[in-house]
Interface confidence: low
């Protein structure tokens, strides 16, 4: 099973129980010798190819438990036949072995008698048969091949013998490793439960962080939802408030400029009139009547009409009315109202925090109580009771094994010694055959007669006969050992080792009422006294092998339902009911009637109806009818063309006066006109489409107000629910994880499965049965081939 997931808990935020490391390996590797064991398994498959007899074994066990067995009963007879049918291959091999055991001593005896009576070979032929050398060669090669086969069998025997010794020596370490793992399981479990409980604080802290930050989490959430509909409107009103201020400033500038222009224009007109009078007076000089001065005077007289100020400057209307209107508009602090609007939004997080203090405290109380509830639930878990009972069992088993291991090691040395003797005996026989062959081949002289043959050749024959003699003497004893070990080893392999690996053995043990006639399921009866509860060896073993927790493996939910006790819905319900009392009242201010009127008044203030063109037209014109500086320089030039005297001097003085008028009167007017131009441009920009703009803002305002009226409560409800879901999500996720961890992860019974594997698969099958089977296979092979060997040797 994977991690439980909760829709509302953050996906990345996963819990993980710290991994428990076990020492004992899951599987046993035989190494290169495994090939030899496989060879034996193939032989056994040939001898015993039938499937594991589940039904037969069940019936057999049921019969075995019966106090008195009636052998005449048909079902007993049928069961016997089934067993015989299943064991046919083994029985056949046993029969052959028994024949070998019975016949070999008899044949040996008769052969011995026969030989003593000089009837069975050993006669010396003077002349060889024609095919004699060929036959001898054939016999020698056959014997050599057979001896090699025997040698391989002996090698198997030695290897098997050595394996038993080395593997049994490893048993102590293997047992210790298993017990260490079982202790780790016992010790780690309380730590795992502690860890699970500790994770509650992590969850609680996360929730507390969100509760403490309710202003930013919930308040911020509400604010984020409202902002897009309100801020743009407030921004527009704010820009309008700025525009009103700019308009006021522009109108004030314009008004003061216009007033200045009125005065400046009057002053300019007055100055120009005065200088014209002076010039006219000067031109009355008698010199003006005399040629060529008269032409100059006439020229000056004609140009006097240009010395006029622009009369339209004084006719530009003031903007008092518009300024009054804007000042009236500014009596309402629109900027302040907008700021209040912003503030009412920005206050949402603080208001949320203030208004939810009690609810938050309530939720915190609930969360703290959930913590103690979980503590109580975990303390009442039956895992500890089972592990305590198991601990006693582990201790007893360990002391039993440590007590009996020396005995096992002692028996092992007897076995090893016995095996060594058997293998050595066979080795001796085969050595005699090899020596016989070697001496025979080396000492052979084709020209020598039987009486004159050499010592080496003769010794070869002796060696062969000694081999034959020893074969007759011991092979039947060896065959007895082979048969016994074969029957035991083959049946254990076929009825325990193979079905254990394929789990068929568990299926037999899981047969209802088999191991105890009162219990349907033995394990549940033994563990919980509830034999109806389906708890099978196969399922428990498989679950343990998969590293599943004890709670889930042993179906402890039947005696203590963690889901019921944790009661996720009740806890989340408690949080939900606290969250339901979370009420937030918001008062979002959006301008109000005063603000609306303010905008409408501004739209009606008249700046959009002003005749800007008339003002702009004047800003492009010269304040006087002519460029006074040019006029003054021209007048000076004309005066210089006159002869020195009063006329020339008075004209020059007037020219200087005109320059002064330009400096003191015209330049300030030009400055004022520039200011007027800028003010008019600002007003023109503001006034352009003002009514439409205000209408649009008011429409947006209505929309925003409607949104607030109709949606604020639903936004608050939605965000509160979302906030609640987040808080609840943390705990749902945590509680689901607890349920998952306790069921699937805590007190993982893997070491139990490993211990069982160690006892059956490793110790019994790999350490004992595999070498035992290899032993009888090797020795059996060697012993069987002693028969053809002795025939060929003779």
């Amino acid at each position: 099973g994977g991690q439980p997931s909760s829709t509302d808990a953050p996906k990345a935020w996963n819990y993980e129980l710290p991994a428990t490391n076990y020492e004992t390996q899951d599987s046993h590797k035989a190494g290169p010798i495994g090939i030899l064991f496989e060879l034996v398994h193939i032989f056994l498959y040939v001898v015993q190819p039938r499937d594991f007899p589940e039904d037969t074994l069940r019936k057999f066990l049921q019969k075995a438990y019966e106090s008195k067995i009636d052998y005449d009963k048909p079902e007993t007879v049928i069961l016997g036949l089934k067993i015989v049918y299943y064991e046919a291959g083994i029985i056949l091999c046993c029969v052959l072995g028994l024949l070998f055991i019975i016949l070999m001593p008899l044949v040996g005896y008769f052969f011995c008698m026969c030989r003593c009576c000089n009837k069975c070979g050993g006669e010396m032929h003077q002349r060889q048969k024609e095919n004699g050398p060929f036959l001898r060669k054939c016999f020698a090669i056959s014997l050599l091949v057979i001896c090699i086969i025997i040698s391989i069998g002996i090698f198997y025997g030695f290897v098997a013998n050595h394996q038993v010794r080395t593997r049994i020596k490893r048993s102590r370490k293997l047992a210790d490793s298993n017990f260490k793992d079982l202790r780790t399981l016992l010790n780690e479990t309380p730590e795992q439960i502690k860890y699970i409980l500790a994770q509650y604080n992590t969850t609680k802290d996360k929730a507390f962080t969100d509760l403490n930050s309710i202003n930013s989490v919930l308040g911020g959430g509400i604010l984020d939802r409202l902002r897009p509909n309100i801020i743009p409107v407030l921004d527009e009103i704010k820009s309008m408030a700025t525009a009103i201020k700019e308009t006021k400033e522009a109108l004030e500038n314009m008004n003061s400029t216009l007033k200045s222009l009125h005065q400046q224009s009057t002053q300019l007109s007055s100055s120009l009139t005065s200088v014209k009078t002076s010039l006219r007076s000067s031109l009355n000089d008698p010199l003006c009547l005399v040629h060529p001065s008269s032409e100059t005077c006439n020229s000056i007289r004609l140009s006097l009409s240009q010395l006029n100020s622009n009369p339209e400057l004084r006719q530009l209307p003031p903007v008092d009315a518009e300024l009054d209107n804007v000042n009236n508009v500014l009596r309402t602090d629109l900027d302040g109202l907008v700021q209040q609007g912003y503030q009412s939004l920005n206050d949402i997080p603080d208001r949320v925090q203030r208004q939810t203090t009690t609810v938050v405290a309530g939720i915190k109380r609930v969360l703290n109580s959930i913590g103690s509830d979980i503590d109580n639930v975990t303390q009442r878990l039956p895992i500890q009771d089972i592990l305590s009972a198991f601990s006693v069992y582990v201790n007893n088993t360990e002391s039993y094994i440590h007590r009996n291991l020396p005995t096992l090691e002692e028996y092992d040395s007897y076995w090893w010694l016995g095996g060594l003797v058997i293998c050595s005996l066979l080795t001796l026989i085969v050595i005699f055959y090899y020596l016989g062959l070697l001496c025979g081949v080396c000492g052979y002289d084709r020209h020598a007669t039987p009486t004159t043959r050499g010592c080496v050749s003769n010794t070869g024959g002796v060696f062969l006969m000694v081999g034959v003699g020893l074969s007759f003497l011991f092979c039947w004893i060896l065959m007895i050992i082979v048969v016994l070990t074969f029957v035991f080893g083959a049946n254990v392999e076929k009825l325990i080792c193979e079905p254990y690996t394929s789990k068929e053995l568990f299926r037999v043990l899981d047969t209802p009422y088999l191991l105890n006639e009162d219990w349907e399921y033995y394990l549940s009866g033994k563990l919980f006294n509830k034999s109806k509860m389906k708890l099978t060896f196969e399922q428990v073993y498989s679950d343990c092998k998969k590293n599943r927790g004890t709670y889930g493996t042993l179906h402890l939910q039947n005696s203590f339902n963690i889901s019921e006790h944790l009661n996720i819905n009740e806890h989340t319900g408690s949080i939900s009911s606290e969250l339901e009392s979370l009420k937030v009242n918001l008062n979002i201010f959006l301008l109000g009637a005063a603000g609306r009127k303010n905008l409408q008044d501004f739209a009606a203030c008249g700046i959009d109806r002003m005749n800007y063109d008339s003002y702009l037209a004047q800003t492009g014109k010269s304040p006087a009818g002519v460029n006074l500086l040019s006029f003054a320089y021209d007048l000076e030039a004309k005066a210089n063309s006159l002869p020195p005297g009063n006329l020339r001097n008075s004209l020059k003085r007037d020219a200087q006066t005109i320059k002064t008028i330009h400096q003191q009167r015209v330049l300030p007017i030009e400055q004022s006109l520039s200011t007027l131009y800028q003010s008019v441009k600002i007003l023109q920009r503001t006034g352009n489409g003002l009514l439409e703009r205000v209408t649009r803002i008011l429409a947006s305002l209505d929309f925003a107000q409607n949104f607030i009226t109709n949606n604020t409560s639903s936004v608050i409800i939605e965000e509160t629910k979302k906030y609640g879901r987040t808080i609840i999500g943390y705990f749902e996720h945590y509680l689901q994880w607890i349920e998952f961890s306790i069921s699937e992860k805590v007190a993982s019974c893997k070491p139990v499965a490993t211990a069982l594997d160690t006892a059956v698969d490793v110790f019994l099958c790999s350490y004992i049965i595999d070498p035992l089977n290899l032993f009888w296979f090797g020795i059996g092979k060697a012993t069987v081939f002693l028969l053809p060997a002795l025939i060929f040797a003779v």
């Epitope: 209040q340 206050d347 603080d350 939810t356 203090t357 009690t358 009242n585 008062n587 109000g592």
Partner: antibody
């Protein structure tokens, strides 16, 4: 039972500093905000600001920005009001109060501060 | 800031009479709260959320109103009710109190 106990009356000279304490009991201190309210002799109540007891963050009313400082000692369930550079017009009774949403439900007995040269 | 105007500033009543204290807000508020303060004591909450009676407060106190106009009624008034009464809003930040109404008993 919820109780807010303030420190005793204070007599100070202008320019000095005073620190008034408010010890809370009977509830989880960090569950409720702490507010400070002042009352000049014969005058009405004036809200000075509040303290977020969860985060320790203070907020001050416009009239009480600058010389006034709120602080807390969570482990002792105590809030503090410190006034620096005392002036004669700081003479008043200072109350601490906890709030429930929009109103003040529990009040301290008040600390009378007299500033006189 | 929202300004709360209480009227009258001082009033006098005889035991058994009905006393009405008004509180007017400069702009609309959703909720109003009323406090009683006796000399040398801190204020005591009487009414919350316009009309809800705080536990331990006698039933002769009641509150009403909406928008900008709110009232506190005491009927029948008793000797022990002589105190200053304050209205308070927290509808708009910052919270503000009324100037207070001093109730004297004849």
């Amino acid at each position: 039972e919820v109780k807010l106990v303030e420190s005793g009356p204070e007599l100070k000279k202008p320019g000095e500093t005073v620190k008034i304490s408010c010890k809370a009991s009977g509830y989880t201190f960090t569950d409720y905000s702490m507010h400070w309210v002042n009352q000049a002799p014969g005058k009405g109540l004036k809200w000075m600001g509040w303290l977020n007891t969860e985060t320790g963050e203070p907020s001050y009313a416009d009239d009480f920005k600058g010389r006034f400082a709120f602080s807390l000692e969570t482990s002792a369930s105590t809030a503090y009001l410190q006034i620096n550079n005392l002036k004669n017009e700081d003479t008043a009774t200072y109350f601490c109060a906890t709030d429930y949403g929009d109103y003040f439900d529990y009040w301290g007995q008040g600390t009378t501060l007299t500033v006189s040269s | 800031d929202i300004v709360l105007t209480q009227s009258p500033a001082i009033m006098s009543a005889s035991p058994g009479e009905k006393v009405t204290i008004s509180c007017s807000a400069s702009s609309s508020v959703s909720y109003m709260y009323w406090y009683q303060q006796k000399p040398g004591q801190p204020p005591r909450l009487l009414i919350y959320l316009v009309s809800n009676l705080e536990s331990g407060v006698p039933a002769r106190f009641s509150g009403s109103g909406s928008g900008t106009d709110f009232t506190l009624n005491i009927h029948p008034v008793e000797e022990e009710d002589a105190a200053t009464y304050y209205c308070q809003q927290y509808h708009s930040y910052p919270p503000t109190f009324g100037a207070g109404t001093k109730l004297e008993l004849k």
